[in-house]
């Protein structure tokens, strides 16, 4: 049956009607409205924007729109005592200081409350010492320094370039290496694309531009003071010393003009190879310390930021389902920005706004979705996904019983080359089918489908004629829904050409230069890519909320489970002798995957053939589909990461942004050759294999015939 038949309404209220109502001009207008002043989490400006969105969503026709507030730990620079880094001479005199703020972009010189660049949640401190350059501060970079080059970071201030991995992982690695402070900087090799001018003349990062960002290692905990529970008025709060995920050493970000001044004097060891060298005119020596003439000079950090419990506000809008009001499809994205949020998050928030408007228009004409749709404007995402996590903690019992799907809606663009999708395998077929019905916005693909341009520009590495869909990692608001609660999740945005643009993120990410003009002049003047993303996100929500049978295909999970089992087995097989010595076998896991594949296949046949006019049977089959993602949740969580509970996927322990498959086994195997007690280490591998086997088998059994 078509979606329109689901709620017995006139055929004009179908997916096409919803998609046709979405307008690029509206998205443009909303983006402009959302980006004129900063909307930093915890500020009055962001509260006012929450109230504006609440009011407009009501006008658009949602059944109810509520503000939900929480009191969470946030972090701000000291207004009267700015953060900076100095080069000091032997007398302690400051001979160079890093900048105190970014030069504001033209037209924004008189805007107040632009927060200067800082690393959110850095502790206060004034460490002083020699500098060590640690490349991207990845796990492998510290292995190279400590194991191969025998360089000790203990007591040193490390300087790391942004990119490749989440900044919080960099800080964690530096802490573990014994560093007393961390300086993060944007190297032009990563944030300046060749042949493009810097802002305001192009989309590249100017030398004074700096990337803000939090440096937490929350591992899904939400508010650092109330892990597992909502930060409401009766919440018990931990002391700051017991807070989750806070860094223990001062951290500060700088731009490449300032980095040049610090790096040009570096002495000590030469960089190990070209992968450690950026594009500045400096030697990229590793250190420690400055070269001959400057060897008596040191680096000193001056960090005075404070962490304080602050009120944040989510906006939650409801469009009640006509047939299954107790089944929730959620579309959520954040509202808080570091400064103007031209891309992050407001290019996403503007799309959500237009999607709400379109759904509201249909509702005003008498239509309702089959299932309830919840719309969310999250607060404090930039401070650790706090708004979404606190709301999910507060509503976890409802969500785990009623949550069908979560579609994330942060930045709609990070480039203008092709589509990028990360989602659960359950949604692969939904995404393929939807993109085949949408028109490509790409030049040279006029009259062709989005699926076609996406497949051509971003082909699947495994299956010819299909586009790439990536694993979900973290670093965004789907985290709690997917990794903690096991709700099927997905995200879509327009992205850059990863082949030719090797820089990390987009150059102006989290800087003051992320403005409306950046988007309107350089990324998407016609807002056609924004419109396409609105169609993909909105279309997914429409189908998830309105299809009679949930548009999930469990067979696609079977395919990836086999792929992931092969991958982890191959990693383990790099140690054949130890596998033999400790009797490590993956046979049980492969057997469970085989069982899953067979049961999923039989389930799909039943799904095709059952009587869809029988509401009990329909509900039963849909529940099996809805609860399949939930079946991959281990209530005990992953080792040392209790809020990452999905056994098939977790954020990488070495890069929060990346997804890892069979993470429990992967982490048990990681660097196993260096473990002091190999017997215990291989025992943990065996334990993790057994957990994965049990989970896959248990998930398979949820798809078996009920009686």
């Amino acid at each position: 049956k078509s979606s329109s038949e689901a709620t017995n309404i006139t055929p004009k209220h179908n997916m096409k009607a919803f998609l046709d109502e979405l307008k690029a001009e509206n998205i443009k207008k909303f983006l402009h409205n959302f980006t004129q002043i900063p909307h930093l989490a915890g500020t009055e400006q962001n509260f006012q924007l929450a109230k504006q969105i609440q009011s407009q969503w009501k006008e658009f026709g949602l059944d109810s729109v509520e503000l939900t507030h929480y009191d969470v730990l946030l972090s701000y620079p000291n207004k009267t005592h700015p953060n900076y880094i100095s080069i000091i001479n032997e007398d302690g005199n400051e001979i160079f200081n890093t900048s105190l703020f970014e030069p504001p972009p033209a037209g924004y010189e008189n805007v107040s409350d632009i927060v200067p660049p800082f690393s959110a949640f850095s502790p206060q401190g004034m460490p002083e010492g020699d500098l060590v350059y640690v490349n991207y501060a990845r796990t492998e970079d510290f292995f190279k320094l400590e194991r191969d080059m025998k360089i000790n970071c203990s007591g040193k201030i490390v300087i790391a370039r942004y990119g490749k991995v989440f900044r919080g992982n960099k800080v964690k690695n530096a802490q573990l290496a014994g560093a007393t402070g961390v300086i993060l900087y944007s190297d032009p090799a990563d944030y300046f694309a060749p042949g493009v001018k810097s802002y305001p003349d192009g989309w590249n990062l100017p030398g004074g531009g700096v990337q803000r960002g939090n440096i937490l290692n929350l591992n899904g905990a939400g508010d650092p003071l109330t892990p597992g529970y909502p930060a409401n008025e009766y919440a018990y709060r931990r002391g700051i010393a017991e807070a989750v995920g806070l860094p223990s050493i001062p951290v500060h970000p700088i731009g490449y003009y300032d980095a040049q001044k610090l790096l040009e004097k570096m002495g000590g060891s030469a960089s190990p190879d070209s992968s450690w060298r950026g594009s500045l005119k400096v030697p990229y020596n590793v250190g420690p310390g400055f070269t001959g003439n400057f060897s008596t000079q040191k680096v000193k950090m001056h960090i005075h930021s404070t962490s304080e419990v602050t009120r944040i506000y989510n906006v939650i809008g409801t469009l009640r389902g006509a047939v299954e009001p107790d089944r929730y499809v959620i579309l959520g994205g954040h509202r808080d920005s570091w400064v103007f949020g031209g891309i992050d998050p407001q290019s996403g928030a503007a799309v959500v706004h237009e999607i709400v408007r379109s759904f509201g228009t249909l509702k005003k004409e008498g239509w309702r979705p089959r299932r309830t749709i919840l719309f969310a404007s999250w607060d404090a995402e930039e401070f650790g996904l706090l708004g979404s996590t606190e709301w999910a903690e507060e509503n976890s019992r409802l969500l785990q019983e009623r949550g069908v799907a979560y579609i994330n809606a942060d930045s709609s663009i990070e480039g203008n080359y092709t589509l990028r999708v990360d989602c659960t395998p359950l949604m692969y077929s939904l995404v393929y089918n939807l993109t085949k019905e949408l028109e490509s916005p790409d030049e040279g693909f006029e009259g062709k489908s989005l699926y076609e341009s996406w497949t051509k520009k971003s082909p699947s590495p495994e299956f010819s004629g299909m586009p790439r869909i990536s694993k979900l990692g973290s670093g965004n608001d789907f985290e709690v829904f997917f990794q903690r609660l096991g709700i099927a999740s997905g995200r879509a945005r327009y992205t850059k050409n990863w082949e030719t643009n090797k820089f990390s993120s987009y150059p102006l990410y989290h800087s003051v230069y992320e403005t409306y003009e950046l988007v309107e002049k350089f990324y998407d003047p016609m807002f056609k890519y924004h419109l396409t993303v609105a169609q993909v996100r909105g279309g997914m929500v429409f189908e998830l909320a309105n299809s009679v049978v949930l548009p999930f295909d469990c067979r696609d999970y079977a395919v990836v489970l086999r792929k992931y089992a092969d991958k982890i087995y191959n990693i383990s097989m790099k140690h054949p002798q130890e596998m033999k010595t400790y009797s490590v076998s993956f046979d049980s896991l492969f057997s469970a995957v085989k069982n899953f594949t067979e049961i999923a296949s039989k389930f799909s046949e039943r799904l095709r053939d059952f009587d869809k006019s029988n509401p009990i049977l329909l509900r039963m089959m849909n529940d099996q589909l809805m609860f399949l993602e939930r079946a991959f949740i281990d209530p005990l969580g992953l080792p040392d990461r209790p809020f990452y509970r999905h056994v098939i996927y977790a954020p990488s322990s070495h890069n929060k942004y990346a997804g890892e498959s069979f993470p429990g086994i992967y982490d048990a195997l990681f660097d196993i050759e260096s473990k002091v007690d190999p017997s215990q280490a291989w025992g943990e591998v065996k334990r993790q294999i057994s957990i994965a086997t049990f989970t896959v088998q248990a998930a398979a059994e949820t798809l078996s015939e009920v009686a």
Epitope: Y84, F96, N97, T98, S99, L100, F101, E102, P103, P104, A106, E109, P206, G207, G208, G255, Y257
Partner: nanobody
Framework: QVQLVESGGGVVQPGRSLRLSCVAS????????MHWVRQAPGKGREWVAV????????YYADSVKGRFTISRDNSKNTLYLQMNSLRPEDTAVYYC????????????????WGQGTTVTVSS
């Protein structure tokens, strides 16, 4: 239009003080490093001092170090030069100048100059 207007010059006795001002208009003052440069009668231009766009760094010519202080008030689009312990050799026309490149400090890369204000140190 883009302009820099200096003021505060005059005739002063050796050992005394003077404060020069330079009001900027027509460009985002807050985003650019600013310099003071001087030209003594019959001589070439001599760089005096520079301040970064945010005031975080200030550098001086050896000839004025410890006596002159460069400062700025971004809310007033104004650059200052406080000159103490003035000497006859400080006699010159003082110009303020704007850095050409947004957000960076260079020793001699200026694109906008004021018309100058004359300082005469004489007993």
């Amino acid at each position: 239009q883009v302009q820099l207007v200096e003021s505060g010059g005059g005739v002063v006795q050796p050992g005394r003080s003077l404060r020069l001002s330079c009001v900027a208009s027509g460009f985002p003052f807050i985003s650019y490093g600013m310099h003071w440069v001087r030209q003594a009668p019959g001589k070439g231009r001599e760089w005096v001092a520079v301040i970064s766009y945010d005031g975080s760094n200030r550098y001086y010519a050896d000839s004025v170090k410890g006596r002159f202080t460069i400062s700025r008030d971004n809310s007033k689009n104004t650059l200052y030069l406080q000159m103490n312990s003035l000497r006859p050799e400080d006699t010159a026309v003082y110009y303020c100048a704007k850095e050409r490149i947004f957000g960076v400090l260079t020793p001699d890369d200026f694109d906008i100059w004021g018309q100058g204000t004359t300082v005469t140190v004489s007993s």
